[in-house]
Structure formats: structure tokens, C-alpha cells
């Protein structure tokens, strides 16, 4: 560690005095301290002399000697007071800049240690400090305002009592800067804009930050626009707003608009697209297939996407039949706005009943006219089956009628014994009817098919079963010949109620 001569922690001299401070170390040594006038430095190998032959109050301060080659970075210091009766303070700075919550050192150095008892910190023009200002004083360093706040950005003076009167220092401006968390916050409204040629439009780009030092600009297709800036301060934030007003838009105004703001922390940008159209438009679409099939008893949501400008003047869902004149309940219709020009309309159809199959139309209107989008809803049903015994052209025939949607397939089974349903062990014969006769097939209704099984002789200890199935389910009917005629059996489990 270097050694300073004189070997005292502090030295008090009068103005005009000669001061010689010598520092000796193992290697080369360097003096440092507050930049001030009249000092001469002289180095001689492992010693360095700092001297003045005309000390002034401005030489008051702490002078440190270091040994640059010392890996431990040892240093020695001496504090010099130049005791000027006319100048109790040596102020090392005109301005002090700190971040919020840092300690702010106001470097008023007392030129006479005897005056320490009567020092105080005030705001300029003798105004008292703000409430909750927590500060301390060191005659070597000055006043420290602890955990400085933005609101404490003021002009301060150091005061000392000399002969019963207060002597003020020159003022020090304290600037407490907000800690900037990142680039300015941005808003660009609207997020999307559509206008018909000739209409007026407004785009507003605004940025805000806790610190006033930031820039904001609006650019159109990478060209910076010259727009007057409005500035404001509220909610402890600085705001800068750029407003682009277009009285009559044309196609050259269309395109990408970017709002860009930057500060020392970096840059933020956000963009929007401005579309200029020749006339009003209204487009309806759906991500769903317009032809829908749903099993009876289940639910369905019909969704329509609407793109429109100007906004919709009216819209509704309509049931077009064929079953009844009922209309969808308004509470089942729901509208959500995706953004200014795009909306989604949903019709909820829970627990569908047979009478609710048919066409549903969504109609919308704006100044561009009417548009409609129609869904066709067909209900799926599991087959219902019935079998009768009859004579056709003199031949005994089992006639099976199956009704359902989609169109059922028909299979005949002959099995031994009397049973409600043939099982594998009992089956004697199986006939598939690949082409049953379609008796009825109207839109939105069940399809009814008929299958004939010609039986020369009914075997009395046997069962004839007609089975029908489709993608929804299956149904069957067992026919049991008895001596007194024929007996038919629908299976116990077939008790379907939609």
C-alpha cells in the first residue's frame, strides 16, 4: 500500500499556502482527486509529488494515491481543507444525475472542519426540503440524499453557520431519472382500417415512457411521415402522440402503417394495415360444410363469418322449413366480433328434434346490400323395422319395412327355435338384400326401404328375423310362425324415442 507524506488523514491549510503531498510506493504511483486548479504533478520513479504554491478553497478535497501495478489495488488518501473564511463550501458539481432509489451525493465539500456542526441542506431561495427527504452529511464528501425520488429533482444549496449567519453554497441541480424498464409503450389505433375512397380517416400513433427522452414516428410503407407531435404528462408518464388525419382517402393512402418509438433501452414498433376500397362490401362464409348431418337428439352450432364495411345494419337467422314455421329462438343466436370488420355469428341448436331438420339461413345487410348463407341440416336416425306376412302373386312372402337415415341396409336371418333375436349358434341361413326397394326418400326425412323374402313353407319351429343397420345404429324385427297364423316380435330393446 502506498504511503502519503504528511502521514495524517486530513490537512488544514489557509488560502495561499504551499501544499506538498508526497506519495511513495513499491512501484510507480499515481495521484487522483477532483479536477481542480493550480496543482502540479511531479513523478520520480516510485514516488509522486502533488503540489501547489497557491492553495485556494477549490483545492479542498480528498486526494488518493494508487499503485497501478498493485494487483490488490491498494491506495492511500489524505483530505485537504483550505480554510477560507469567505468560502465555506467547495462545490465540485453544477449538476448531479442519479437514477431513482439511488443515493444522490451533492458534493458540497466543507472547507473548514470546524463548521460541521452548523451545516444544513436547503432548496434554492431558502425553501425547506421536501417532506420525507432523508439525508446525511460528510465533511469530506457532502450531503447524501438517500434513495432519491424523481420528485426530488430540484436545485439545492448547502448552508453553513459562520459567525451566526448562514452562508450558502452555489446551487447544485439534482436530476433524478426514472429507471427506464425498456423501450416506450406503444399504441396504434385502429389496429386495422378500411375506408371507401373519398371518406375521411384517422390513424393515431402514441408512445409513453417514464422518461421524457424518447422519440416516436409514424411511417407509411417505410416512409417516415412528417406529423406534428402532441406531448403530455399524466399518470407519471410522458406521452407523445402523432395523429394522421386524412380528409379524403385515395388508393395511395392504403398500405402498411408503423408506429415506432425508441429510447436508450431500444426500439418498439407496431403496425396496422389500411385498406381503401371502391365501394361497400359484405362477404359471408363458413368454415363448416353448408350441408350438415347430425344424429337426432344431438346438438349443432352453425357458424357464419361476416366481413363487412361499412358495419352491418341488420342480421338474423331464419328457418326455411320444411317441417314447421317455427323460427330459431333469439337466445340461441350469438354474435362475436373478431375485429372491426370481421364478425362471427353462431346459431346453437341443442338436442335436435325431428321437426328441426331443414334449411337455416343467415341474412345480413349493410349499405352494400343483402347477403344470405344457407345451411341444409339433415338428421340421422337409427333404423326402425317392422315385418309382416303376406301373399304376393300367390306366394307367401315376408315383407320387411325399415326406416332411418342414412338409408338402412337389410339382412334376413332364419334360425331354429322361437326367439326374439337370432344368435350365431341358432342361425340356419342368412340372406343379404343389397338393393332393397326405396319406398320414400324426401329431403330432410327418413329413407324407408322395403325388402321381400319369399318363403314357400313357413317352418313352425323357426324364427325369421329382419335386421336393418346404418351408420347410426341398427334395428330388427323377429317373425315367429305359429299354427294359428303368424306372430311378430319387435325386439325388447327397440324403444327409441327421439
Amino acid at each position: 500500500i502506498p504511503v502519503i507524506e504528511p502521514s495524517v488523514p486530513e490537512l488544514v491549510v489557509k488560502p495561499g499556502a504551499t501544499v506538498t503531498l508526497r506519495c511513495v510506493g513499491n512501484g510507480s504511483v499515481e495521484w487522483d482527486g477532483p479536477p481542480s486548479p493550480h496543482w502540479t504533478l511531479y513523478s520520480d520513479g516510485s514516488s509522486s509529488i502533488l503540489s501547489t504554491n497557491n492553495a485556494t478553497f477549490q483545492n479542498t478535497g480528498t486526494y488518493r494515491c494508487t499503485e497501478p501495478g498493485d494487483p490488490l489495488g491498494g491506495s492511500a488518501a489524505i483530505h485537504l481543507y483550505v480554510k477560507d473564511p469567505a468560502r465555506p463550501w467547495n462545490v465540485l458539481a453544477q449538476e448531479v444525475v442519479v437514477f431513482e432509489d439511488q443515493d444522490a451525493l451533492l458534493p458540497c465539500l466543507l472547507t473548514d472542519p470546524v463548521l460541521e456542526a452548523g451545516v444544513s441542506l436547503v432548496r434554492v431561495r431558502g425553501r425547506p426540503l421536501m417532506r420525507h427527504t432523508n439525508y446525511s452529511f460528510s465533511p469530506w464528501h457532502g450531503f447524501t440524499i438517500h434513495r432519491a425520488k424523481f420528485i426530488q429533482s430540484q436545485d439545492y444549496q448547502c448552508s453553513a453557520l459562520m459567525g451566526g449567519r448562514k452562508v450558502m453554497s452555489i446551487s447544485i441541480r439534482l436530476k433524478v431519472q426514472k429507471v427506464i424498464p425498456g423501450p416506450p409503450a406503444l399504441t396504434l389505433v385502429p389496429a386495422e382500417l378500411v375506408r371507401i375512397r373519398g371518406e375521411a380517416a384517422q390513424i393515431v400513433c402514441s408512445a409513453s415512457s417514464v422518461d421524457v427522452n424518447f422519440d416516436v414516428f409514424l411511417q407509411h410503407n417505410n416512409t417516415k411521415l412528417a406529423i406534428p407531435q402532441q406531448s403530455d404528462f399524466h399518470n407519471n408518464r410522458y406521452q407523445k402522440v402523432l395523429t394522421l388525419n386524412l380528409d379524403q382517402v385515395d388508393f395511395q393512402h392504403a398500405g402498411n402503417y408503423s408506429c415506432v418509438a425508441s429510447n436508450v433501452q431500444g426500439k418498439h414498433s407496431t403496425s396496422m394495415f389500411f385498406r381503401v376500397v371502391e365501394s361497400a362490401y359484405l362477404n359471408l362464409s363458413s368454415e363448416q360444410n353448408l350441408i350438415q348431418e347430425v344424429t337426432v337428439g344431438e346438438g349443432l352450432n352453425l357458424k357464419v363469418m361476416v366481413e363487412a364495411y361499412p358495419g352491418l345494419q341488420g342480421f338474423n337467422w331464419t328457418y326455411l322449413g320444411p317441417f314447421s314455421d317455427h323460427q330459431p329462438e333469439p337466445k340461441l343466436a350469438n354474435a362475436t366480433t373478431k375485429d372491426t370488420y370481421r364478425h362471427t355469428f353462431t346459431l346453437s341448436l341443442p338436442r335436435l328434434k325431428p321437426s328441426e331438420a331443414g334449411r337455416y339461413s343467415f341474412l345480413a345487410r349493410n349499405p352494400g346490400g343483402w347477403r344470405a348463407l344457407t345451411f341444409e341440416l339433415t338428421l340421422r336416425y337409427p333404423p326402425e323395422v317392422s315385418v309382416i306376412w303376406t301373399f304376393i302373386n300367390g306366394s307367401g312372402t315376408l315383407l320387411c319395412a325399415a326406416s332411418g337415415y342414412p338409408q338402412p341396409n337389410v339382412t334376413w336371418l332364419q334360425c331354429s327355435g322361437h326367439t326374439d333375436r337370432c344368435d350365431e349358434a341358432q342361425v340356419l341361413q342368412v340372406w343379404d338384400d343389397p338393393y332393397p326397394e326405396v319406398l320414400s326418400q324426401e329431403p330432410f326425412h327418413k329413407v324407408t326401404v322395403q325388402s321381400l323374402l319369399t318363403v314357400e313353407t313357413l317352418e313352425h319351429n323357426q324364427t325369421y328375423e329382419c335386421r336393418a343397420h346404418n351408420s347410426v345404429g341398427s334395428g330388427s324385427w323377429a317373425f315367429i310362425p305359429i299354427s294359428a297364423g303368424a306372430h311378430t316380435h319387435p325386439p325388447d330393446e327397440f324403444l327409441f324415442t327421439p
Epitope: S36, P37, H38, W39, T40, L41, Y42, L92, A93, L105
Partner: antibody, heavy 117, light 110 residues
Framework: QVQLQESGPGLVKPSETLSLTCTVS????????WSWIRQPAGKGLEWIGR???????NYNPSLKSRVSMSVDTSKNQFSLKLSSVTAADTAVYYC???????????WGQGTLVTVSS | QSVLTQPPSASGTPGQRVTISCSGS????????VNWYQQLPGTAPKLLIY???QRPSGVPDRFSGSKSGTSASLAISGLQSEDEADYSC???????????FGGGTKLTVL
């Protein structure tokens, strides 16, 4: 070996604010005075101001109304802001370490700032 | 207009001794020490002399400084081609409360 590096935009529009940062490497920024100095083309050097690591500053009186400096010891950086610039502020800007005796022992390589629309 | 006055140019032949002057006032050179900087073309200034006549380590003893009253001078003996540069003087100014510089002298080695 202490090294200084200036950074910031090379072109600033008239009336806007010039912002430069000096990053110190190879040594600590603490307990030293750091200055900004500029040199217009073909002219002499001009001291702009200094900042100590505690945040206290002194500015050249001719520029005082437009200058602001700050220091960030955590990043080993100090910065300069010069507002309301004109073409007369076009210069090479240097950052430097100032020592007792008003001499500058370490300098950045300098950055040319042009003020033009 | 620089506060300290220097001749705009100086020249010498290799091996020669050249002197560059710097003149100020009582508020700067008259009451404070003088520092000298060398600026090679396209580079930053480099400290050459501090506190009137002190050389930082690495500066050849061909360079020397002196001060008298409100003037100072830099002497370069045994001039070499690599000495071709701009040389600026500087001093603390009491009224500025900071350093002031000369306008620089362009030294040409002929």
C-alpha cells in the same frame, strides 16, 4: 489496459437530440472522472463536460443549457445528450478519462456525428 | 476560436529539433499546468506531456515540455518521420472550471 468505446447514431437531424454512450472496458469506471470532448473537422478540441461515478457533473458554460450526462456504473458506461443540435455541432466526439491536473490519459477512438436533415 | 493559441503548422527535417508554442492567459496557463497531446492522422489524441514537463510511461524522452508565465512550449529533438502529427496544448482554465485546448499545430517532417 483501460479501453473506451463510443457508440451512437452517426447522423442526427437539426433540432433533435444527439445521444452517445461510452463503454469502459479493462478497468472499473468507479472513482474516476469521465469527460466528453469534441473536435469539428479541421479545428481544435473542445471540452464538453465531465461526470464522476457518483453522478455529479460539470459542463462547459457555452454548452451547459443543452448538455446532460449520466453514468451507469453497473454497465461500466456513461452517456452524453446534447439537445437542439445544429450543423455547428457536427464533429468527432471523444470520451476520455480525466485525471487530476486536467489531463486525459485514456481516450476512445472517436465517433463522427453529422447534423444534417 | 480556441482559447489557447498555437501556430497552425510547423516543420522540420529528420534529426532536427522543433519547438511548438502555446500561449494563453493568467486564468489558464498563467496559474495552471500545461498538458500536450499528439494526434496521428485519423486517430484519437494521445497524452504526450502532463503537468508542464512530465512524460507518461512509453513516451520517448525526445519529447519535452516547459512553461513560462502564460506561455508553454513543446520541444521534439531528433525528429523522426513518425512524429508527423497534430500537437495540441491544454490547461485548466479557472473561469471555465475545466480544461481548454489550443487549435493544434500540424507538424510536417520534411
Amino acid at each position: 489496459q483501460v479501453q473506451l468505446q463510443e457508440s451512437g447514431p452517426g447522423l442526427v437531424k437539426p433540432s433533435e437530440t444527439l445521444s452517445l454512450t461510452c463503454t469502459v472496458s479493462g478497468g472499473s469506471i468507479s472513482s474516476y472522472y469521465w469527460s466528453w470532448i469534441r473536435q469539428p473537422a479541421g479545428k481544435g478540441l473542445e471540452w464538453i463536460g465531465r461526470i464522476y461515478t457518483s453522478g455529479y457533473t460539470n459542463y462547459n458554460p457555452s454548452l451547459k443549457s443543452r448538455v446532460s450526462m449520466s453514468v451507469d456504473t453497473s454497465k461500466n458506461q456513461f452517456s452524453l445528450k446534447l439537445s437542439s443540435v445544429t450543423a455547428a455541432d457536427t464533429a468527432v466526439y471523444y470520451c476520455a478519462r480525466e485525471r487530476l491536473g486536467a489531463f486525459f490519459d485514456y481516450w476512445g477512438q472517436g465517433t463522427l456525428v453529422t447534423v444534417s436533415s | 476560436q480556441s482559447v489557447l493559441t498555437q501556430p497552425p503548422s510547423a516543420s522540420g527535417t529528420p534529426g532536427q529539433r522543433v519547438t511548438i508554442s502555446c500561449s494563453g492567459s493568467s486564468s489558464n496557463i498563467g496559474s495552471n499546468t500545461v498538458n500536450w497531446y499528439q494526434q496521428l492522422p485519423g486517430t484519437a489524441p494521445k497524452l504526450l506531456i502532463y503537468s508542464n514537463n512530465q512524460r507518461p510511461s512509453g513516451v520517448p524522452d525526445r519529447f519535452s515540455g516547459s512553461k513560462s508565465g502564460t506561455s508553454a512550449s513543446l520541444a521534439i529533438s531528433g525528429l523522426q518521420s513518425e512524429d508527423e502529427a497534430d500537437y495540441s496544448c491544454a490547461a485548466w482554465d479557472d473561469s471555465l472550471n475545466g480544461p481548454v485546448f489550443g487549435g493544434g499545430t500540424k507538424l510536417t517532417v520534411l
